[in-house]
């Protein structure tokens, strides 16, 4: 069993989560989860759904009778989201922390809109990588 | 040139973000981008960049002389990151708007950490798309 | 003939909180930002916060984002500025501006400026 289970089952107990009555009004993020197949619509929706952990564990920092549980439920979200990778984890914290009021940022971000907006779709590649995908396919259709 | 990019233009000119200065001390965003090549990484990084660009225009919904730029580019965002698709953009907001505050969503979010946890590694798929794969595979060895 | 009044300072241990209000006069607001600006002893004028009169569409300088909040009253024509969290490095004149742009960090781009009300941080 992951180390996970035992340390969420102690914060249901803390929360007082593990009532029947918590299940009213549908799920946050199961049924969201159940929608999408495809990995990179997981990725897209599970990205959201583990910032939202992080801040809400964020909030809790100072109850100490939760930390262990916490660290350990954070380390094993590490290993499972991240694949205990420290920059992906570190590019991540650094995304999910800029301030939208920080007039900084603002300018930065808007400076960067034209860019940003011409690597969101997938077919958004660079031309290397383009190629290397071409050659995959090309690989594919002649075995 | 996809309608974004005037009305990006247009926004750089409202925040004066076409400075030199606004390049300083780094980027927020691109820098980030570059490190990551695996498309299911991208969109860990462009979840949270889509969702950081709809609340800084969130913040600045009341200025009117944006407004027309600020709504085409939330459309061509929507076109490029979601496929045009209501539904992953509705579940994108709904995931996004969830209060880390609110005691009833902080009781859901830990009634759900388990179920969530398991789902989080590519590998954790349901029984039936393991098969798949594994039939997948099998016919690709026997090619 | 536009005025702003700027009102709310003080002396404070560090770590307190203060008011700071503009109230507006001599024409319609609602189209525009109004900002904060500081000075302190022997240093330039800096932006701090700004927001348009309508509400919303804030920012705020690097230094006081998530101390310092700016909000407007458009019935008063007031803007105010709450400060917590205040540190001794907050100590300057702060002024109340109707920028000429509507997002502006430069203070030789303002219109308008309040008189100045001082705010000391003390340690």
């Known amino acids: 069993q992951d180390p996970y289970v035992k340390e969420a089952e102690n914060l249901k107990k803390y929360f007082n989560a593990g009532h029947s009555d918590v299940a009213d009004n549908g799920t946050l993020f199961l049924g969201i989860l159940k929608n999408w197949k495809e990995e990179s619509d997981r990725k897209i929706m599970q990205s959201q759904i583990v910032s939202f952990y992080f801040k809400l564990f964020k909030n809790f920092k100072d109850d100490q009778s939760i930390q262990k549980s916490v660290e350990t439920i954070k380390e094993d979200m590490n290993v499972k989201f991240f694949n205990s990778n420290k920059k992906k984890r570190d590019d991540f914290e650094k995304l999910t922390n800029y301030s939208v009021t920080d007039l900084n940022v603002q300018r930065k971000a808007i400076h960067e809109l034209i860019q940003v907006m011409a690597e969101l779709s997938p077919a958004a590649k660079t031309g290397k990588r383009k190629r290397s995908q071409m050659l995959f396919r090309g690989r594919r259709a002649s075995q | 040139q996809d309608p974004y990019v005037k009305e990006a233009e247009n926004l750089k000119k409202y925040f004066n973000a076409g400075h030199s200065d606004v390049a300083d001390n780094g980027t927020l965003f691109l820098g980030i981008l570059k490190n990551w090549k695996e498309e299911s990484d991208r969109k860990i990084m462009q979840s949270q960049i889509v969702s950081f660009y709809f609340k800084l225009f969130k913040n600045f919904k009341d200025d009117q002389s944006i407004q027309k730029s600020v709504e085409t580019i939330k459309e061509d965002m929507n076109v490029k990151f979601f496929n045009s698709n209501k539904k992953k953009r509705d579940d994108f907001e709904k995931l996004t708007n969830y209060s880390v505050t609110d005691l009833n969503v902080q009781r859901k979010a830990i009634h759900e950490l388990i179920q969530v946890m398991a789902e989080l590694s590519p590998a954790a798929k349901t029984g039936k798309r393991k098969r798949s794969q594994m039939l997948f595979r099998g016919r690709r060895a026997s090619q | 003939q536009v005025q702003l009044q700027d009102s709310g300072g003080g002396t404070v241990q560090a770590g307190g909180s203060l008011r700071l209000s503009c109230a507006a006069s001599?024409?319609?607001?609602?189209?525009?930002?109004v900002g904060w600006f500081r000075q302190a002893p022997g240093k330039e004028r800096e932006f701090v916060a700004r927001i348009k009169w309508s509400g919303g569409s804030r920012s705020y300088a690097n230094s006081v984002d998530g101390r310092f909040t700016v909000s407007t009253d458009n019935a008063k024509n007031t803007v105010y500025l709450q400060m917590n969290s205040l540190k001794p490095e907050d100590t300057a004149i702060y002024y109340c501006a109707l920028p000429s742009n509507i997002i502006t960090t430069d203070y030789l781009r303002v219109y308008y400026w309040g008189q100045g009300t001082q705010v000391t941080v003390s340690s």
């Open positions: 001599g024409r319609t607001f609602s189209n525009y930002a």
